[in-house]
Interface confidence: low
């Protein structure tokens, strides 16, 4: 529906609180280096303007698009050129090119200081002194570090953040109440950010068709009782929501997401029996709940797929008349029967089916040609099954930390050119697949593991895209979205890699390591492990294990010493010499 004033329309739909929060998120995701106070000032100016448009939609500039209004506002920032360099050139462009330009300058790894958590009493005082500013600051800090965070979901996180402080700041033991909640929000937030980043990469790098295919498969697994027409409608609406959020249209996105949740809840009977509880919740919780809802039970009497997609004499006719819809139906029918498959596996099967029909429908005897198409699926299904079985066995044998180390070594040997922090971050996340998925029964392992790995490998792809250093990473990331994981799995040791020069400084440690948390200490050790592999890519598992065991013993010994710094200096030299000898460096 056309509105005289888009900004007034969104302000009225969303309400002032959500409007201001979403504009703040949008601005922080675009100008990631700007101080908090500057963003708050811009948001207040936009909000005052929106109110004038609500009062009179015909007022000056109220008919302008949101991109024009927001872009004009961002381009008033005085230090744009000094802070952002060439991003300032975006302001010379007209819409829609200006918004595209801002989007291209979003930085997945901005050079921002790590968020340090203050003492609980300090946080509670800040919360009580000015709750509104405290919560805005949360939105700002998350949004600027995660420029693709799903904005309506960030509102949900902020609501939970507020609830945690409201409850815990009046508890007897504030820290015991608050810290676990903040840890949970942090971990869930990182996971949510990474999942959304994959959706945006899918839309931006592979197009709407790829995203729609993903959505058909996932929603068909989740709502197997829904008709194909119903799934089609949900897919179209969901695609619009994510296209908007990934494109920086956060007000439209949040508004449309609310409409979609409303539609789903009004039509539960024809969608899923699992939605009842979700639909009784308030808006933000409702949308989150729907997005995470468990798969409904499969209808009992689903016929064999072969009848419609292999045996029917109309296969080629149906395919020719509406290719994407026919493939969409195939994907829907296959996915609703296979909640035990990962979405990416279902998409590989659909791609194989499509390739077979393209070839066979042009053949002399099409039916003869595609009659055995389902046999081609067997190896595609078995490959992830076997990989998950092997890796879960390894995880159960080693535990999470050592499993991460095995993956660190594996991936450093595959792509040693990638920066050490990226290899550590990605391998640690890959390693978390064990504790996340291996506990599940067989029927849930593959969707859990392979779809999670897709999210983590996308992190590698977006970080690598910023500063490309490896042709192999570029190839796996860009050739096929659904084959990224098999592509990385298939990589062997990079024989072309010239080992890194040995630098003793890299392996010099100080007493500060003793005061680090267990997680931070692990990261230090894992960083050293990656560097070792970069120096000696042909080192065996046994050699690396021996050096890492020595290293762990060295840290433990020096952290117990009276004069820690002297111990690290002297014992460190001995460790480096011993390691060089052990590895033949």
């Amino acid at each position: 529906d056309a509105h005289k004033s888009e900004v007034a329309h969104r302000f009225k739909d969303l309400g002032e609180e959500n409007f201001k929060a979403l504009v703040l998120i949008a601005f922080a995701q675009y100008l990631q280096q700007c101080p908090f106070e500057d963003h708050v000032k811009l948001v207040n100016e936009v909000t005052e303007f929106a109110k004038t448009c609500v009062a009179d939609e015909s007022a000056e500039n109220c008919d302008k698009s949101l991109h024009t209004l927001f872009g004009d506002k961002l381009c008033t920032v005085a230090t744009l050129r000094e802070t952002y360099g060439e991003m300032a050139d975006c302001c010379a462009k007209q819409e829609p090119e200006r918004n595209e330009c801002f989007l291209q300058h979003k930085d997945d790894n901005p050079n921002l200081p790590r968020l340090v958590r203050p003492e609980v009493d300090v946080m509670c005082t800040a919360f009580h002194d000015n709750e509104e500013t405290f919560l805005k600051k949360y939105l700002y800090e998350i949004a600027r570090r995660h420029p693709y965070f799903y904005a309506p979901e960030l509102l949900f996180f902020a609501k939970r953040y507020k609830a945690a402080f409201t409850e815990c700041c009046q508890a007897a033991d504030k820290a015991a109440c608050l810290l676990p909640k903040l840890d949970e929000l942090r971990d869930e937030g990182k996971a949510s950010s990474a999942k959304q980043r994959l959706k945006c990469a899918s839309l931006q790098k592979f197009g709407e068709r790829a995203f729609k295919a993903w959505a058909v498969a996932r929603l068909s697994q989740r709502f197997p009782k829904a008709e194909f027409a119903e799934v089609s409608k949900l897919v179209t609406d969901l695609t619009k929501v994510h296209t908007e959020c990934c494109h920086g249209d956060l007000l439209e996105c949040a508004d449309d997401r609310a409409d979609l949740a409303k539609y789903i809840c009004e039509n539960q009977d024809s969608i899923s029996s699992k939605l009842k509880e979700c639909c009784e919740k308030p808006l933000l919780e409702k949308s989150h709940c729907i997005a995470e809802v468990e798969n409904d039970e499969m209808p009992a009497d689903l016929p064999s797929l072969a009848a419609d997609f292999v045996e029917s004499k109309d296969v080629c006719k149906n395919y020719a008349e509406a290719k994407d819809v026919f493939l969409g139906m195939f994907l829907y029918e296959y996915a609703r029967r296979h909640p035990d498959y990962s979405v990416v596996l279902l998409l590989r099967l659909a791609k194989t089916y499509e390739t077979t029909l393209e070839k066979c429908c042009a053949a002399a005897d099409p039916h003869e040609c595609y009659a055995k198409v389902f046999d081609e699926f067997k190896p595609l299904v078995e490959e992830p099954q076997n990989l998950i079985k092997q890796n879960c066995e390894l995880f159960e044998q080693l535990g999470e930390y050592k499993f991460q180390n095995a993956l660190l070594v594996r991936y450093t040997k595959k792509v040693p050119q990638v920066s050490t922090p990226t290899l550590v971050e990605v391998s640690r996340n890959l390693g978390k697949v064990g504790s996340k998925c291996c506990k599940h029964p067989e029927a849930k392992r593959m969707p859990c593991a392979e779809d999670y790995l897709s999210v983590v490998l996308n992190q590698l792809c977006v970080l690598h895209e910023k500063t490309p250093v490896s042709d192999r990473v570029t190839k796996c990331c860009t050739e096929s979205l659904v084959n990224r994981r098999p592509c990385f799995s298939a990589l062997e040791v990079d024989e072309t890699y010239v080992p890194k020069e040995f630098n003793a400084e890299t392996f010099t440690f100080h007493a500060d390591i003793c005061t680090l948390s267990e997680k931070e200490r692990q990261i230090k050790k894992q960083t050293a492990l990656v560097e070792l592999v970069k120096h000696k890519p042909k080192a065996t598992k046994e050699q690396l294990k021996a050096v890492m065991d020595d290293f762990a013993a060295f840290v433990e010994k020096c952290c117990k010493a009276d004069d820690k710094e002297t111990c690290f200096a002297e014992e460190g030299k001995k460790l480096v010499a011993a390691s060089q000898a052990a590895l033949g460096l």
Partner: nanobody
Framework: QVQLQESGGGLVQPGGSLRLSCVAS????????MGWYRQAPGKQRELVAS???????HYADTVKGRFTISKDNAANMVYLQMNALEPEDTAVYYC?????????WGQGTQVTVSS
């Protein structure tokens, strides 16, 4: 490829009625939206009425109470019953059907309301 064909347009006096029909030919699965739009000379195309997969309907304010949209899923048909027609309803009426494969439009049928 999917094709839509509208019929039922024509010349009618103010206060009169017409029933527009639209049929989708070709293989079209998973229709989730069927709608009628119209375009008067020198104006933008505007939504008249739509019906979604769940059967819920939406009407432009100018036609509420006078026009009724309905569909026949089995026959891939959508209808627009237009009563109490006014000269302002004069336009080319277009049928629109959407599914996961895309958005399909008919060629249009002319409706003229004049005495």
């Amino acid at each position: 490829q999917v094709q839509l064909q509208e019929s039922g347009g024509g010349l009618v006096q103010p206060g009169g009625s017409l029933r527009l029909s639209c049929v989708a030919s070709g293989s079209i699965w998973g229709i989730y939206h069927m709608g009628w739009y119209r375009q008067a000379p020198g104006k933008q195309r505007e939504l008249v009425a739509s019906i979604t997969v769940d059967g819920s309907t939406h009407y432009a304010d100018t036609v509420k109470g006078r026009f009724t949209i309905s569909k026949d899923n089995a026959a891939n048909m959508v209808y627009l019953q237009m009563n109490a027609l006014e000269p302002e309803d004069t336009a080319v009426y277009y049928c629109d059907i959407r599914n996961v494969g895309g958005d399909y439009w008919g060629q249009g049928t002319q409706v003229t309301v004049s005495s």
